[in-house]
Amino acid sequence: IWSAVFLNSLFNQEVQIPLTESYCGPCPKNWICYKNNCYQFFDESKNWYESQASCMSQNASLLKVYSKEDQDLLKLVKSYHWMGLVHIPTNGSWQWEDGSILSPNLLTIIEMQKGDCALYASSFKGYIENCSTPNTYICMQRTV
Amino acid sequence: IWSAVFLNSLFNQEVQIPLTESYCGPCPKNWICYKNNCYQFFDESKNWYESQASCMSQNASLLKVYSKEDQDLLKLVKSYHWMGLVHIPTNGSWQWEDGSILSPNLLTIIEMQKGDCALYASSFKGYIENCSTPNTYICMQRTV
């Protein structure tokens, strides 16, 4: 985040940016930036693997839910979208693409279908779904 | 938008921010930034006038829908929220807080109640509602 004060002094501009204002990012062009994370919602329906590949091709990953506070914008998301949560059959756990385990109480998991992948829907719910089912998806990029 | 190249040369940093990446804002702290507009969703229910006052106190206005392309993040918004659209009984038109008239084909207006204010709901729908009814609301700030 480039603080407004720093930018003002640097460019010696007259524009007064309040101290409470800040820049967000950097993010890929036309992505949503919130609390220094970048999000994009993709309309085209793909299976989980294709969705993952699409996010990876944009230097991002499928949505990881890690904090209700930092990601409270997700409360209001309509419809169902692939996120980066998968079932690891060997130990029965659910984990994110980066290998971290799903924290308890972050998501309410709902039995929708038999499957090893999960869709995100509003109010921090995850819906179990077959990974080969096409769905829209959310990519996410953590800023440095 | 501060382009990555400009920032890199300016600060003489080694960090490689891809050309396609950019900063968004400035926005009030912890607001959503998208295509250089700032948005915030407020959970507390207020009537339209109180919602307007709340946005104004934050140097913002109630949501103005002006472009389906630039505001496509609004497609996926769940639930109903006050926006800055009001009915002008004298000429029967709907206009935004800034006095501009609602462009045709931007919103599908649905008569939910008798009223002079409008709630925003997903997929660019506007629901007519009594202005004194409490609802959650969306504030918006256009960046310079």
Epitope: T90, I109, M112, K114 | -
Partner: antibody, heavy 121, light 107 residues
């Protein structure tokens, strides 16, 4: 505490239908699937199918496909299993059990008390 | 359908004995297997889920393990209340299938 309360004993004629209910309490009904399992007298357990309570989508065992309908009423937190064209070999205790996929929640961690359905002419 | 072959079909043992019941799947089912205990006139009770996870409230003398397509339920030291019928269930694939049951009786 979690409870699944089933409807009472039924006696039916061959060719008739039976509808067994299972009222859930003590948990969020829509979060879990609901499975139906039967057990003929002195026999083992047989999986009939399950319903995603959240969206009402059922998954039936092929053996019962066309004869069984599973539904869920999220207003009353009650699941139903209807079996049609009853035969004498449908005589069994019918159980409802919580869970449908086994992918996240332990499967069948709570069971109803069972409903005896007797098919006899 | 996946066949679950449970053995033995019946077993006599004494209090304090270590008892092992096996289920063999006709194909790979990952760890998608549970074990259930049923007493006469009662609904089954979940003991083990995902092959080796102990359901809460179940005594630690019960354990589950897997080797390939062979799954084992072990009771380390039989107690009087353990005499019952035990079933395995695969939930890897539709239709879910149970083993035919193992009746554990007092010797």
């Amino acid at each position: 505490q979690v409870q699944l309360q089933q409807s009472g004993t039924e006696v039916k004629k061959p060719g008739a239908s039976v509808k067994v209910s299972c009222k859930a309490s003590g948990y969020t009904f829509t979060t879990y699937g609901l499975t139906w399992i039967r057990q003929a007298p002195g026999q083992g357990l047989e999986w009939m199918g399950w319903i995603s309570v959240f969206n009402g989508s059922p998954n039936y065992s092929l053996k019962f496909q066309g004869r069984v309908t599973m539904t869920a009423d999220t207003f009353t937190n009650t699941a139903y299993m209807e079996l049609r064209s009853l035969r004498s070999d449908d005589t069994a205790v019918y159980y409802c059990a919580r869970g449908g996929t086994g992918d996240y929640y332990p499967l069948f961690d709570y069971w109803g008390q069972g409903t005896l359905v007797t098919v006899s002419s | 359908a996946i066949r679950m072959t449970q053995s033995p079909s019946s077993l006599s043992a004494s209090v304090g004995d270590r008892v092992t019941i096996t289920c063999r799947a006709s194909q790979g089912i990952r760890n998608d297997l549970g074990w259930y205990q049923q007493k006469p006139g009662k609904a089954p009770k979940l003991l083990i889920f995902a092959a080796s996870n102990l359901e809460s409230g179940v005594p630690s003398r019960f354990s589950g393990s897997r080797f390939g397509t062979d799954f084992t339920l072990t009771i380390s030291s039989l107690q009087p209340e353990d005499f019952a019928t035990y079933y395995c269930l695969q939930d890897y694939n539709y239709p879910y299938t149970f083993g035919q049951g193992t009746k554990l009786e007092i010797k």
